[in-house]
């Protein structure tokens, strides 16, 4: 077993020790005090002075060094001889041991190097991992951006194609519009031609009407003459009858004729004791002319003369001025009593007007005017109303002040349009106003958003067409 060790003795000299079996060899290398003394002014690692040493000192120092060198050289030579003479075998072993030791040192150094290399490698791996992470993250971001860019590019492409489609569509529509314009021009031309033809036709009709009017005047004159003749004949007959009426039975029959009861309105009918609702014959004031009217003997004490009723759409209310003047329809159903009769009646005494309304949802409402009358035909049967009460709106749906009556052939409204033609039916149109109870009759589920229906604006608005309406009058003092 051999071992080689390097250490220091108690005074700090270097010593080399070789262990061989049970023998141990120690080599002490000589050192001079001058060399070792830290207090010596000549220590090699002392701070260099600014001023140079004295020459004699230098020479002395060199001499000392030379002698030490000489001693050392001699000592080394002796040692060398000793080793060569006495320790050739051990030398081999020592060399082997030295090689082993150096190998161990080398291995240790190698191990250290390996450890350091491993540490560096680990650090590098860490850095590499970080770089990889960063790279991966960047790659992902790049991928995302790439995808986003692709998506945007696709969207742009889609939009571009959409724009192209729209442009194509636009071009097509433009072409269509141009075609339509051409068609319209042609149509306008044909309409103009039709209009010219119609004007010619109207002119012809006007001349025919004028001729008919002339004939009517002639007929009226003839009629008047005939009426006069008839009147004269009646009087003659009456005189003759009076002269020859000698029997009591004849006298009694004439008396009965003179005492026949006539009713001016339904209030008169009610007062006479006839209190059942139904159709009664009424006589025009100051005249023998008669008309049939429906008397409502139940509502609010009875005695109401019905002047208008809508309930099922069975009667056409788009009528002429003359028809509205004399009346039309069936008094027990849908009808208009007649403007002339109502005008004459309401100018005799003060009347109230009650308008009863029903919607399609089963609701009922009414408007009551405490004073109502119509002007004569000379003033287009203008309506006059005062004192509104009731549940069908606090504002009158018949425009105030009252308007003239208009029909499809008599435009007396305040609109540049012709309300009666546009909204249908005869009414006291303003321009065109908030009501028209003589409008088109619309059935249920078709009765909304109708501008030409049966309208009472302040109860149901402008587009609601009512289910049923009744207009009735009664003397204010009933």
């Amino acid at each position: 077993y051999s071992n080689f060790r390097k250490s220091m003795d108690s005074v700090g000299r270097k010593q080399y020790q070789v262990q061989h079996g049970s023998c141990s060899y120690t080599f002490l290398l000589p050192e001079t005090d001058n060399c070792r003394s830290s207090s010596s002014p000549y220590v090699s690692n002392a701070v260099q002075r600014d001023a140079p040493l004295d020459y004699d000192d230098s020479v002395h120092r060199l001499q000392v060094l030379e002698s030490i060198m000489e001693n050392n050289t001699q000592w080394l030579m002796k040692l060398e001889n000793y080793i060569q003479d006495n320790m050739k075998k051990e030398m081999v072993e020592i060399q082997q041991n030295a090689v082993q030791n150096q190998t161990a040192v080398m291995i240790e150094i190698g191990t250290n190097l390996l450890n350091q290399t491993a540490e560096q490698t680990r650090k590098l791996t860490d850095v590499e991992a970080q770089v990889l992470n960063q790279t991966t993250r960047l790659e992902l971001q790049l991928l995302e951006h790439s995808l986003s860019t692709n998506k945007l590019e696709k969207q742009i492409l889609d939009q571009t194609s959409e724009i192209n489609k729209l442009q194509d569509k636009n071009s097509f529509l433009e072409k269509k519009v141009l075609d339509m314009e051409d068609k319209h021009i042609v149509q306008l031309q044909s309409i103009k031609e039709e209009k010219d033809q119609l004007q010619v036709l109207v002119s012809k009709q006007n001349s025919i009407i004028e001729e008919l009017e002339r004939q009517l005047v002639t007929a009226t004159v003839n009629n008047s003459a005939l009426q006069k003749q008839q009147h004269d004949l009646t009087e003659t007959v009456h005189s003759l009858l009076t002269m020859i009426a000698t029997s009591s039975s004849a006298k009694n029959s004439f008396a009965a004729k003179e005492e026949q009861i006539t009713f001016r309105d339904c209030a008169d009918v009610f007062r006479s004791g006839l209190t059942t609702s139904g159709i009664y014959t009424l006589t025009f004031p100051n005249s023998t002319e008669e008309t049939k009217a429906y008397c409502d003997m139940e509502t609010g004490g009875g005695g109401w003369t019905t002047i208008q009723r809508r309930e099922d759409g069975s009667v056409d209310f788009q009528r002429t001025w003359k028809e509205y003047k004399v009346g039309f329809g069936n008094p027990s159903g849908e009808h208009w009593l007649g403007n002339e009769f109502v005008s004459q009646l309401t100018n005799q005494q003060r009347y109230v007007l009650k308008i009863h309304l029903r919607d399609w949802e089963g609701n009922e409402a009414y408007s009551l005017y405490e004073h109502f009358y119509l002007s004569s035909e000379e003033f287009n049967y203008r309506i006059h109303l005062k004192g509104l009460t009731g549940t069908a709106g606090k504002i009158s749906s018949i425009s105030q002040p009252g308007n003239d009556f208009s029909t499809k052939d008599a435009d007396n409204d305040k609109c540049i349009c012709k309300c009666s033609q546009m909204l249908t039916g005869g009414w006291w149109f303003d321009a065109c106003g908030p009501s028209n109870l003589n409008g088109m009759y619309y059935p249920q589920r078709q009765n909304t958003n109708k501008f030409n229906g049966i309208k009472w604006y302040y109860w149901k608005g402008s587009g609601y067409s009512l289910k049923a309406t009744t207009m009735m009058i009664r003397p204010a003092d009933f």
């Epitope: 504002i395 303003d430 065109c432 604006y457 402008s462 587009g463």
Partner: nanobody
């Protein structure tokens, strides 16, 4: 000339309240039925509510019934819409409109609208 000017719109949180006003001029306000109509972003016009001329009768769309209240002050020529318990779906431009006598239930004059945004 007839003019209708809405105001009172703005941003409000769900469950919040707003009161819209519509100032009318150029016509006899007390003689006309008035309506509120709204238009959600990208959608069509939807009727919201109406009030008759004297304020005695009102009507509402099912979607706002119980939450919105229409009213009017004829002395001030102003129409109102009180909106409570607002929802995100109430976000829209709100218009007031006049129902003409002969408009067949349609509107002959409109305001310029006021935007109501319901968002948290």
């Amino acid at each position: 000339q007839v003019q209708l000017v809405e105001s009172g719109g703005g941003l409000v949180q769900p469950g919040g309240s707003l009161r819209l006003s519509c100032a009318a001029s150029g016509f006899t306000f007390s003689s006309y039925w008035m309506h509120w109509v709204r238009q959600a972003p990208g959608k069509g016009l939807v009727w919201v509510s109406r009030i008759n001329s004297d304020g005695s009768s009102t009507s509402y769309a099912d979607s706002v019934k119980g939450r919105f209240t229409i009213s009017r002050d004829n002395a001030k020529n102003t129409l109102y819409l009180q909106m409570n318990s607002l929802r995100a779906e109430d976000t829209a431009v709100y218009y007031c409109a006049r129902e003409g006598y002969s408009s067949g239930g349609q509107f002959d004059y409109w305001g310029q609208g006021t935007l109501v945004t319901v968002s948290s």
